[in-house]
């Protein structure tokens, strides 16, 4: 009975990802059988999130969209080990938004899913930012630098990266 | 008061080219992101080129994208659009524009009076 | 790209009386409560003017007889008392995301 209303549970569960996300990628966290995360196919998981390269090019305001009606954000980076996860999913020769603005171009940056803006987690390439008419983030390649984050025009379409939290069941 | 002053237009023909000029006063140019839009005979508007104040990025519509090239001398005050492989569809009066962000996006608040472009054997 | 479709073409009004001229965009432009749309005047053998930016905002200069408003993919410029120097072609454009698109024009005379 237990096991059977679980099972319950875990497909009703998945009914709520599934317009979305018909396919799901699911992995036993531990030891325990009761506990697995997903991550949608064919998106790649590191520690509990899950991510998309969005390889169609659009402006900041709808890769974002694009991103939320996956249920997922624009990428938020929070330590130098997810860039270092993220990066090997990139082509070097493409250039990817990240989920950080400065919408009222007064260098106030801000992540999509209000994260604070902590300074000294930031992975900007030298010299940048630097352009107040730039307002939004990207993450690309510089062979001086590898790979670092620029500021560029939000209208301007690039490919992206979306991320979500990792599915329970 | 801004003005943008464009020149270096005129008659040339297919497969010809041309440097235009916009020459800026009024305000300081080298922080601002610049464009040329330009108007064919009785037609609409068309978006060609922009510019970052740097000069390090710059954006263009297919239709013009490895033609036409965007470039500027902060030192000198000047916005340039060097155009190649010119086609009869490029004769249009040219005006250069400055750039105001507007949260994620922008308008073009100032125009220059345009130069005019004929494309013609 | 995103069309912007104006209507109508042309628009003749008598003078002190209302001219609406309508704009549709082929997707939405909106985003986080603001909408990417611009309104331009283009009067003969002269620039375009900017009057209204990000749909509803009035331009610094201009008289406060013209108006935007509108979200997601129609916008609407009015003039609420047409005045003999509004006579002109208005332009919409979009700058949600390159490149940036405007519509075909409409074109306002005296009735």
């Known amino acids: 009975n237990f096991m059977y209303s679980k099972t319950v549970k875990r497909l009703s569960k998945l009914r709520e990802y599934q317009q979305y996300h018909p396919s799901l990628t699911c992995v036993m966290e531990g030891k325990d059988i009761e506990d697995w995360s997903c991550c949608p196919t064919p998106w790649t998981s590191f520690q509990s999130s899950c991510y998309f390269i969005s390889t169609g090019m659009q402006s900041w305001t709808k890769s974002q969209k694009n991103c939320s009606v996956m249920g997922a954000d624009l990428v938020v980076i929070n330590t130098r080990e997810e860039q270092d996860f993220i990066i090997q999913n990139l082509k070097r020769n493409s250039s990817y938004f990240l989920g950080l603005s400065d919408p009222g171009g007064r260098r106030h940056w801000q992540w999509v899913d209000q994260t604070p803006y902590n300074e000294n987690v930031t992975f900007w390439h030298s010299g940048e930012p630097n352009n107040l008419d730039e307002r939004c983030a990207i993450i690309n390649f510089r062979s001086s630098e590898e790979w670092g984050w620029n500021d560029i025009h939000c209208h301007v379409p690039q490919k992206s990266i979306c991320k979500m939290k990792k599915i329970y069941i | 008061e801004v003005q943008l002053l464009e020149s270096g237009g005129g008659l040339v023909q297919p497969g010809g080219s041309l440097r235009l000029s916009c020459a800026a006063s009024?305000?300081?140019?080298?922080?601002?992101?610049m464009s040329w839009v330009r108007q064919a005979p009785g037609k609409g508007l068309e978006w060609v080129a922009t510019i970052n104040s740097g000069g390090d990025n710059t954006y263009y519509p297919d239709s013009v994208k490895g033609r036409f090239t965007i470039s500027r001398d902060n030192s000198k005050n000047t916005l340039y659009l060097q155009m190649n492989s010119l086609r009869a569809e490029d004769t249009a009066v040219y005006y250069c524009?400055?750039?105001?962000?507007?949260?994620?996006?922008?308008?073009?608040?100032?125009w220059g009076q345009g130069t005019t472009v004929t494309v013609s054997s | 790209d995103i069309v912007m479709t104006q209507s109508p073409d042309s628009l003749a009004v008598s003078l002190g009386e209302r001219a609406t001229i309508n704009c549709k965009a082929s997707q939405s432009v909106d985003y986080d409560g603001n909408s990417y749309v611009n309104w331009y005047q283009q009067k003969p053998g002269q620039p375009p003017k900017l009057l209204i930016y990000?749909?509803?905002n009035l331009e610094s200069g201009i008289p406060d007889r013209f108006s935007g408003s509108g979200s997601g993919t129609d916008f609407t410029l009015t003039i609420s008392s047409l005045q003999a120097e509004d006579v002109a072609v208005y332009y919409c454009q979009q700058s949600d995301e390159d490149p940036w698109t405007f519509g075909g024009g409409t074109k306002v005379e005296i009735k």
């Open positions: 990000g749909a509803s």
């Open positions: 524009a400055t750039y105001r962000p507007y949260y994620y996006g922008s308008v073009l608040d100032y």
């Open positions: 009024g305000f300081t140019f080298s922080t601002y992101t």
